[in-house]
Structures are given as structure tokens and as C-alpha cells.
Interface confidence: medium
């Protein structure tokens, strides 16, 4: 850009792009300022005046530099079986996750609609596949030579201790009992745990300003004339009126 062109709005060089945190307004045919996170475009720029930004209202947010006419609504309040892991602020959406020991049993793009308690494997069964944010624990019978004596959503089957002389043979739900004071080999005392799933899924992630109308479209996919994220060149020749579609 020529050195004298420093302030928005300005006309870009032919074939040129707007600078960081600016966008090209199709109507004004000028490079104009974007609004920072937590704000939105209250008045769009003209050839002689720059974008006028305004703070997001309560329960709305913008996470990126943008030129959207309205801030995005924060997601629904978290349900009773969820915890709010991130509050709704002007710059970020609310994030709800299922409580520890629970997972999301039914979800839509808007987030988890119903949390369910992770299955507990009963004695004689161990965790074959641990639970995740969106899937239940899978239990399996303990194979010969292994056991689980707990009711747990994290314990796996453990090998029986090996005895010099066996007092009571182990089975799927009980360890072997040795007559000698020390077995030749044993697992460390206590159950072996699989880690609990760490729930990080956002209930609502930042959607595009022109929301998807396709049922299967991910909330994260840019649809329509989305403002480019911070750091892009802003060379998007979209007009702000498109946002009202």
C-alpha cells in the first residue's frame, strides 16, 4: 500500500488486498475496519466513514474480528446433568460438558441434549474400551488368568498373582490366594484404572455469521459469506447485506 494511505476507509490498489483486521466492503468499494471480539458492526462503512462498532449485548458474543451486524447468541444454559466449563462472555460462548462419570448420549449441533451415566463393569468384567465424551464404556469378561473384583467404569481386568503354592485358585472375579507369604509375582496393590474421559467438547462452537441451513452441516464449517478469521488478509469481496440471507 502507498505510505500515505494509512487510515480506513481507503481504496485498495488494483488487485491488492486489505490489511489485517480490515475487510473489503463491496458497496463502498473500500477497505474498512473490522470490529474486535466482543463487538459487532453497528454501522457499516461508506466511502467517507469507517465501520462503527458496538459492544455485544448480554448473552451474545463474537469470538473473532468481524463485521457481522449482530453478535451471536450464547448457547442455552447448561442442563442439570452438565457443568458449565466456560461462561458466556462478550468474547466467548458458553461451554457445557457432562459431569465426570457421565457422557453425552444424545447430541445435536447445539450441544449435548442428554447426558447418561457411564456403564460400570461388574466383578468378573473389566473395561475393554473406556468411555469418552460421546460414548459409553464397553465391558468384557475377564479372560482366564485375569480378574476384576470391583464394580467400576474405569477398572480393567488384572492378572492373577502367581503363587508358589495356591491356596485358592483365582477366577474372573477374584484374585488367587497364595499359601506362601509372598507370591512370585503380583500386580501392584489396588485396582488398575483407565483414565476418565476428559470432556472438552464445546456445547456451542463459534458458528459462522450466516448459519447453516443444512441439517448435517457441521457448526464449524464456514457457510455463505463468512467473515474471515483474524489473521486473514480480508480480501473477501462480499457485501455485508449478504448476512441478512
Amino acid at each position: 500500500l502507498p505510505a500515505q494511505v494509512a487510515f480506513t476507509p481507503y481504496a485498495p490498489e488494483p488487485g491488492g488486498t486489505c490489511r489485517l483486521r480490515e475487510y473489503y466492503d463491496q458497496t463502498a468499494q473500500m477497505c474498512c475496519s473490522k470490529c474486535p471480539p466482543g463487538q459487532h458492526a453497528k454501522v457499516f462503512c461508506t466511502k467517507t466513514s469507517d465501520t462503527v462498532c458496538d459492544s455485544c449485548e448480554d448473552s451474545t458474543y463474537t469470538q473473532l474480528w468481524n463485521w457481522v451486524p449482530e453478535c451471536l447468541s450464547c448457547g442455552s444454559r447448561c442442563s442439570s446433568d452438565q457443568v458449565e466449563t466456560q461462561a458466556c462472555t462478550r468474547e466467548q460462548n458458553r461451554i457445557c460438558t457432562c459431569r465426570p462419570g457421565w457422557y453425552c448420549a444424545l447430541s445435536k449441533q447445539e450441544g449435548c441434549r442428554l447426558c447418561a451415566q457411564l456403564r460400570k463393569c461388574r466383578p468378573g468384567f473389566g473395561v475393554a474400551r473406556p468411555g469418552t465424551e460421546t460414548s459409553d464404556v464397553v465391558c468384557k469378561p475377564c479372560a482366564p488368568g485375569t480378574f476384576s473384583n470391583t464394580t467400576s467404569s474405569t477398572d480393567i481386568c488384572r492378572p492373577h498373582q502367581i503363587c508358589h503354592v495356591v491356596a485358592i485358585p483365582g477366577n474372573a472375579s477374584m484374585d488367587a490366594v497364595c499359601t506362601s507369604t509372598s507370591p512370585t509375582r503380583s500386580m501392584a496393590p489396588g485396582a488398575v484404572h483407565l483414565p476418565q474421559p476428559v470432556s472438552t467438547r464445546s456445547q456451542h462452537t463459534q458458528p459462522t455469521p450466516a448459519p447453516s441451513t443444512a441439517p448435517g452441516t457441521s457448526f464449524l464449517l464456514p457457510v455463505g459469506p463468512s467473515p474471515p478469521a483474524e489473521g486473514s488478509t480480508g480480501d473477501h469481496h462480499h457485501h455485508h447485506h449478504h448476512h441478512h440471507h
Epitope: 448473552s59 447468541s73 442455552s76 448420549a105 441451513t213
Partner: antibody, heavy 120, light 111 residues
């Protein structure tokens, strides 16, 4: 208390469009889904689709894609359904209903219905 | 799509007796111990009204003579005892997956 107030009866010509409205009150409009359901005279209920007004996200029954367009205006807490290229098959009563994001996952409050008659 | 088949299509019951309506799904509507099956009552000229949600939960304000049971593919709505105000059409509906679907309806009459 939760209320859904639907617009009045519509008489339309084949090939034209109508836009039905559903004004919500008594709860936070952007927190829950608005569903639309069709009922032809003497027939059962058919789910058209739903919109989440907080984001504008929509979910459609494949059968009604291209026929129904769901929108919502947060400022007036009103959901809309536009029916296009009307034929006699579209003559029916159309209901809007609220479905909470959490919990019941059922349509717990309904509008009174809007009758659409398509006739030349 | 999940197809819901209601039976019978119509039912005549004496006042004070029990009415039982069945709804069978073409595939399971269960997920993680929850059944996403609901029951609605529609009186002629009125919108449907939610009676039972998630198979067996009584909606607030609905009389206790209405109850729901079942799991996976087979569900039942029971009205016991039937009153004159219960003359209506009853629909089951699943919300396990899109598109949500309704049963064909069961018309309850008093004999």
C-alpha cells in the same frame, strides 16, 4: 407461562408462497427449538423440521426440503415458515411447537395452528 | 426413517375401564438407557398436547390416570380409568433421530 401464537388462516393460489409466523413468549426464545408439524384434514401428524433460533441452525425432514424454509427473528421472538410453490397437497393445518434442548426432548408446548388452503 | 405403527387404529372403551394403545417402532428408539418415545393427545379442533415424554415420564399437569411404558421398539400408553374428557386421538412420536416421526394415531371413543 410458555405461549406460541400463530398467524391467521391463509388462502393461497397454486404456485404462490405463504409465510406463517409463530410468536413465542414466556421463555427464552433463543434457548430452545421451534418445530413445525403438518396435519392434513382427518390425517395424522408429519414433522417438517425445526430451527434453533439462537444460531439459526435448521433441521429438515427430507420430504419438505425445498418446500419449507424455516427462519427466526430473535428481536421479536418469532419463528417463520415459508411454504413455496404451493399445490393442493399443501392444504393443511400447520403447527409450531417448542422442544427444549435438554430434558424431555419432546414438543411440550404447541401453537394453535394455522390453516392453509390452496385453491385456484 | 423410523416408522411408528400404532394399534389399534380406533378403540371403544367403557367409562371407568382401561384403555391400552400400542406403538411399535421399526428400529430401537433407545439410547443409553433412555427411550426417546413420547405420547400426545389431540382433541378435535385443538393442537396436540404432550402427555408422556421419554416413554414413561408424566408431563406436568397431566392426570395420573395416564401412564406410559416400554423400551426399544415396543411402547404402550395406558389410560386407567378412562373418562369422558379422554375422547381424542392419541399419537406416539420418536425423537431419537431426524426426521422425527409420528405414529398414525389411535382414535379413542367411549362405548
Amino acid at each position: 407461562q410458555v405461549q406460541l401464537q400463530q398467524s391467521g388462516a391463509e388462502l393461497a393460489r397454486p404456485g404462490t408462497s405463504v409465510k406463517l409466523s409463530c410468536k413465542a413468549s414466556g421463555y427464552t426464545f433463543t434457548d430452545d427449538y421451534i418445530d413445525w408439524v403438518k396435519q392434513r384434514t382427518g390425517q395424522g401428524l408429519e414433522w417438517i423440521g425445526e430451527i434453533y433460533p439462537g444460531s439459526g441452525n435448521t433441521y429438515y425432514n427430507e420430504k419438505f426440503k425445498g418446500k419449507a424454509t424455516l427462519t427466526a427473528d430473535k428481536s421479536s421472538s418469532t419463528a417463520y415458515m415459508q411454504l413455496s410453490s404451493l399445490t393442493s397437497e399443501d392444504s393443511a393445518v400447520y403447527f409450531c411447537a417448542r422442544s427444549q434442548v435438554y430434558g424431555k426432548i419432546a414438543m411440550d408446548h404447541w401453537g394453535q395452528g394455522t390453516s392453509v388452503t390452496v385453491s385456484s | 426413517d423410523i416408522v411408528l405403527t400404532q394399534s389399534p387404529a380406533s378403540l371403544a372403551v367403557s367409562l371407568g375401564q382401561r384403555a391400552t394403545i400400542s406403538c411399535r417402532a421399526s428400529e430401537s428408539v433407545d439410547n443409553s438407557g433412555n427411550s426417546f418415545m413420547h405420547w400426545y393427545q389431540q382433541i378435535p379442533g385443538q393442537p396436540p398436547k404432550l402427555l408422556i415424554y421419554r416413554a414413561s415420564n408424566l408431563e406436568s399437569g397431566i392426570p395420573a390416570r395416564f401412564s406410559g411404558s416400554g423400551a426399544r421398539t415396543d411402547f404402550t400408553l395406558t389410560i386407567d380409568p378412562v373418562g369422558a374428557v379422554d375422547v381424542a386421538t392419541y399419537y406416539c412420536q420418536q425423537s431419537k433421530e431426524d426426521p422425527y416421526t409420528f405414529g398414525g394415531g389411535t382414535k379413542l371413543e367411549i362405548e
